[in-house]
Interface confidence: low
């Protein structure tokens, strides 16, 4: 679709005749009737077949013709097409005196003719008017031409339809050829395909419009390069969605079991050393003077029993005193003013003289100690409970009620589900709270390690001489396939070179 | 015609910054990209990058973000790339060139400018 | 990254043979956005062939390109003594837009 453009320019018709030759009275009043046609190379009566125009009055006899004429008439003359340009035509320019009103073919008197040219050639599409002048005996008209497309037509044809637009269906200007040129950020063959944030992951991330980066399920972040790992994973990382790969000292299947208790908690006061025993249990060695699962508590000086031989102990700011039973003295009442005469020794002990009789000892009998078998036995008041066993005092005896998944004497074993090697392969085992976990080999997975994955073991890239490299999924081993001129089982000896074996 | 004029020939101290200009002429500026390639002594050609002359919207090579900045100035049609950190690595005549932004092809390009970095 | 690769990397012929350049992609490519340029010493580069098959304004018709996917072919017809130069293939189908490494082509 597009636009022939005529535009008169200029008239001269100095003696005022018609193509008779007749003058016109009082003066020829002229208008022009334009008639345009498929290219013929002689130019014939017969239809407009690219249409036709005609004009008011324009002037008399001579005259210049402006830009827009005035009265109704338009310069340039507008011939539309809508049909593909063909490139050539045909042009007849008719000039009509009229002398009334009424400029109709069949208003008019046969000879009111004045002159009537006619071209033809060809004519490109462009916005350059080509200018000409014809002239007759009695007449010269001056005139330029063009063809246009009309808005949204492009091509050297005017056949091409483009509509600029910015919307779902694309967003594009038109180049002059007709050509979509996609507003930047977008792409594609209809620009509807947006251009996603510089560095968006490729497969990961996508964009529904320019500059986004949308991320699909599982990952994460500006550019959609994080992986997002496992709902409920607490001290763990990824490497792709929705894994768990514990940090070190975690374990368990979301890595929130704590296998490294003291590092992370510090359960121990006072300057006690820590040790991890398993799943969130450890163990606090406590410095002197302190005591308690935690060694929380501080020891008072008279807790250790310092006086003997059933002497009081009373605490003081710069540490105790004992205050010595009858017969007793020293600091810790450890002198003795008496011998087995004063039957010193109580709770059934027996009494043994020493040094010719200046002194004695007491052999207690069982449950019962010091010096004169005073004190009855606590068999738990040295805490011998290991990993926050309870002591309990069973008559001559004690014994130690040990917390989950500790056993011994002193609930000083751990009650290890690894004990029986339950993980195959060459799996690591991780003792934990409510079971164990396998940390398994290259090569195999599951809970106990016990299936066999494929190893990638071309990965180490063991093919020399760009030879190409095939994993046998049943071994675990490669192969590789030797290009032309070059042998051995990673293709590393040119053929015609042997290899030097040392034998 | 259309044409894209650069810049004479710079010399670098390793460290420093370079800025190369490329100003367009027969066309309408803001319906085009360009696009900035580099091309190192005998070696073959690297694309380092694209700006939209339209909103200035941009999208840098990997391996160059970071240094790299791509401008345009619509008032003068002028599209600029400025490399910091110079290395002798990045010895090379750059070259900018046109593209459609759904014709991703280079056409036409600048005569290109060489860019030496040397202590 | 795409990775273009194109063979061979030198090819030694006379005016008047036919050449055939090759550009394989690491993975497969929209014809629409490939390209082949042309390169002189001392020039820029210059647009032979887009879309895989179009040639651009003003190249002549001994000039042609085919190919689709990994595989797409540059073929000079009937080699004209201006015709020896450096070619490269590129694609901008991914970012990052990538250039094959050149094929030069040199008189025998």
């Known amino acids: 679709s597009g636009v022939f453009q005529l535009q008169l320019q200029e008239f001269i018709n100095e003696r005022g005749v018609l193509a008779s030759g007749r003058p016109c009275e009082p003066g020829c009043r002229t208008f022009f009737r334009v008639c345009l046609k498929h290219f013929q190379a002689v130019v014939s009566p017969g239809p407009c077949t690219f249409g036709t125009v005609s004009t008011p009055v324009l002037g008399t006899n001579s005259f210049a013709v402006r830009d827009d004429s005035s009265g109704g008439g338009r310069n340039p003359l507008q011939l539309p097409f809508n049909f593909t340009w063909p490139g050539t035509f045909s042009l007849i320019i008719e000039a009509w005196h009229a002398p009334g009103d009424d400029l109709r073919p069949e208003a008019l008197p046969p000879d009111a003719l004045i002159s009537k040219i006619a071209i033809q050639g060809s004519l490109a599409v462009g916005q350059n008017w080509l200018l000409d002048e014809q002239t007759s005996t009695l007449t010269r008209l001056r005139y330029s031409y063009r063809v246009i497309c009309s808005d949204n037509y492009y091509g050297d044809n005017c056949s091409r339809l483009c509509k600029k637009r910015n919307d779902h269906f694309g967003h594009y200007v038109c180049q002059p050829d007709g050509n979509l040129s996609c507003l930047p950020g977008w792409t594609g063959e209809y620009c509807q395909q947006p251009i996603c944030l510089s560095g968006c992951h490729e497969q990961n991330g996508y964009c529904s419009k320019p500059a986004e980066c949308l991320c699909r399920p599982g990952w994460q972040g500006r550019l959609c390069n994080e992986c997002i790992p496992h709902n409920g994973c607490r001290h763990g990382t990824c490497s792709t969605p929705w894994q768990c790969t514990c940090d070190e000292g975690w374990g368990g299947l979301f890595c929130d079991q704590d296998l490294n208790y003291c590092t992370h908690h510090s359960p121990c006061k006072n300057g006690a050393t820590c040790s991890n025993s398993g799943q969130r249990s450890y163990t606090c060695t406590c410095r002197p003077g302190y005591t308690g699962v935690d060694c929380e508590l501080e020891l008072s000086e008279c807790d250790s029993n310092p006086c003997r031989n059933g002497g009081s102990c009373k605490d003081q700011e710069d540490g105790y005193h004992c205050l010595c039973p009858p017969g007793y003295y020293g600091l810790h009442c450890e002198h003795s003013t008496l011998s087995c005469a004063d039957s010193p020794c109580f709770n059934g002990g027996s009494c043994r003289e020493r040094n010719q009789g200046a002194n004695y000892a007491c052999e207690c009998p069982p449950n019962f100690t010091g010096s004169n078998c005073e004190k009855k036995v606590d068999r738990c008041t040295s805490n011998p409970c290991a990993n926050g066993g309870q002591c309990l005092n069973r008559g001559p005896s004690r014994m130690c009620r040990c917390r989950p998944g500790f056993t011994g004497t002193y609930c000083e074993l751990h009650v290890s589900d690894c004990a029986r090697n339950p993980c195959a392969h060459g799996g690591t085992c991780h003792d934990l709270e409510n079971g164990l976990m396998c940390t398994c080999p290259a090569g195999f997975s599951g809970r106990r390690c016990e299936v066999r994955t494929s190893i990638d073991a071309c990965a180490s890239s063991p093919c020399f001489n760009r030879a190409t490299c095939y994993t046998d999924l049943s071994t675990d081993t490669f192969v590789c396939n030797c290009p032309y001129g070059f042998v051995g089982s990673r293709c590393e000896f040119p053929v015609g070179l042997p290899p030097s074996f040392p034998w | 015609q259309v044409q894209l004029v650069q810049s004479g020939a710079e010399v670098k101290k390793p460290g420093a910054s370079v800025k190369v200009s490329c100003k367009a002429s027969?066309?309408?500026?803001?319906?085009?990209?360009i696009s900035w390639v580099r091309q190192a002594p005998g070696q073959g050609l690297e694309w380092m990058g694209w700006?939209?002359?339209?909103?200035?919207?941009?999208n840098y090579a990997q391996k160059l973000q970071g240094r790299v900045t791509m401008t345009t100035d619509t008032s003068t049609s002028t599209a600029y790339m400025e490399l910091r950190s110079l290395r002798s690595d990045d010895t090379a005549v750059y070259y900018c060139?046109?593209?459609?932004?759904?014709?991703?092809?280079?056409?036409?390009w600048g005569q290109g400018t060489l860019v030496t970095v040397s202590s | 990254e795409i990775v273009l690769t194109q063979s061979p990397g030198t090819l030694s012929l006379s005016p008047g043979e036919r050449a055939t350049l090759s550009c394989r992609a690491s993975?497969?490519?929209?014809?629409?956005?490939l390209a082949w340029y042309q390169q002189k010493p001392g020039q820029a580069p210059r647009l032979l062939i887009y879309?895989?098959?179009s040639r651009a304004t003003g190249i002549p018709d001994r000039f042609s390109g085919s190919g689709s996917g990994t595989d797409f072919t540059l073929t000079i017809s009937r080699l004209e003594p201006e015709d020896f130069a450096v070619y490269y293939c590129?694609?901008?189908?991914?970012?990052?837009?990538?250039f094959g490494q050149g094929t030069k082509v040199e008189i025998k």
């Open positions: 060139a046109r593209y459609s932004w759904n014709k991703h092809w280079f056409d036409p």
């Open positions: 027969g066309y309408t500026f803001t319906y085009y990209g």
């Open positions: 700006i939209s002359a339209y909103d200035g919207n941009t």
């Open positions: 993975q497969s490519v929209t014809g629409s956005y």
């Open positions: 879309g895989a098959s």
């Open positions: 590129q694609q901008s189908a991914f970012s990052p837009w990538t």
